[in-house]
Interface confidence: low
Amino acid sequence: RKIPKVGHTFFQKPESCPPVPGGSMKLDIGIINENQRVSMSRNIESRSTSPWNYTVTWDPNRYPSEVVQAQCRNLGCINAQGKEDISMNSVPIQQETLVVRRKHQGCSVSFQLEKVLVTVGCTCVTPVIHHVQ
Amino acid sequence: RKIPKVGHTFFQKPESCPPVPGGSMKLDIGIINENQRVSMSRNIESRSTSPWNYTVTWDPNRYPSEVVQAQCRNLGCINAQGKEDISMNSVPIQQETLVVRRKHQGCSVSFQLEKVLVTVGCTCVTPVIHHVQ
């Protein structure tokens, strides 16, 4: 799912207040709900009829530093016999997410939000049939 | 996939630099890669063998204000005949994502990162069989 554009309102102060100096805002340290955890079924990437592998990308100047990307293993889906059925398609499920980019200039450290496209997993779909006219 | 804890290093300045005043940091306005877009296959939530519905949650003090959550429509999966097959399971695919929380204290506006658990879609899996001893 996609993240809408910021526009020019979210990060601004109310009109009656003085403007934000120097095009930057105050970001408080600490993360709300930091202890919240994913509770997905075990090994769904292997047990799925549209199985996938994970690749980890690492960047020390990004939070989170680790971003995990899924790749569908097959073009088709795995049937009850464990064989690939190409009458169906394994397709990626994508999600836009925010990360924080750290920018250094000597002792001056600032941060900026960055939009990242993450493939979270795969699902098995009936293909769209294009009829030849 | 889960976001690791912040720890105490990412948002800190280098050791040789004076500490961050008042427990806050400078967040630059603007979003890197803001125009990046999800390019998922059309209507996969309806075409999937583990179909799902979307619910939109709205919060004006969050960026993005709109967060979309998926809910699996069935316990089982949809077979080639369009019937639910309960020998298989539809399971949610979850992703931890960051949002930005806007905090007002009069004209003092600050922001804080918040972790949100998003169900992105569903996939069809072979159930885990628990053998009775």
Epitope: P14, I32 | K103, H104, Q112
Partner: antibody, heavy 126, light 107 residues
Amino acid sequence: EVQLEESGGGLVQPGGSLRLSCAASGFPFSNYEMNWVRQAPGKGLEWISYISVSGGPAHYADSVKGRFTISRDDATKSLFLQMNRLRADDTAVYYCVRREYVTGRNYNYYPYMDVWGTGTTVTVSP
Amino acid sequence: DIQMTQSPSSLSASVGDRVTITCRASQTISDYLNWYQHKPGEAPKLLIYSASTLQRGVPSRFSGSGSGTDFVFTISSLQSDDFATYYCQQTSSTALTFGGGTKVEVK
């Protein structure tokens, strides 16, 4: 001076309706989340409703859900509570309350209620 | 909504006494707990937030502790100005629910 002043209370019969108002002054009302809290005779404080800023989400205590509606008009710096299908156990002093935040040692935000009105009395009786 | 259970509902004490009030949440709320003092005809006053942090200007005889579901509020040496009703309030959810209150009366 930061102030909240409630009005609209009174005597009403069970099943009746009442609309409470709260006039804010001395602070930028539109920037603050607001609440209604009540205190029944001889009882403790009971939070009943919350409204976010900018027409954001509203929340209600189970005891009033489906009967009470909170709303705000930032242009007139007013908070409202529309009370329908009133019952005898709704009899209480109703306070309009501002929600504020303090930042803890761990940099989390901790909400609390910092500015309270003097209250308006609602009596539900046949 | 999260339910807050406060005990005792009332207690009698004398100036100089140590007073302890407990508050239990129906589910874990980490340290999202406030304590207020409420006197008749006055607005409730915040004493403690984040379970144990004293609000600016509040005397050090007031203290709080606890995390998760169980919390304790203590007045180390009761003063004449402290006779009032005390409330805990959870702030872990949008519904900032209160405990039933503890009335501290003169013995």
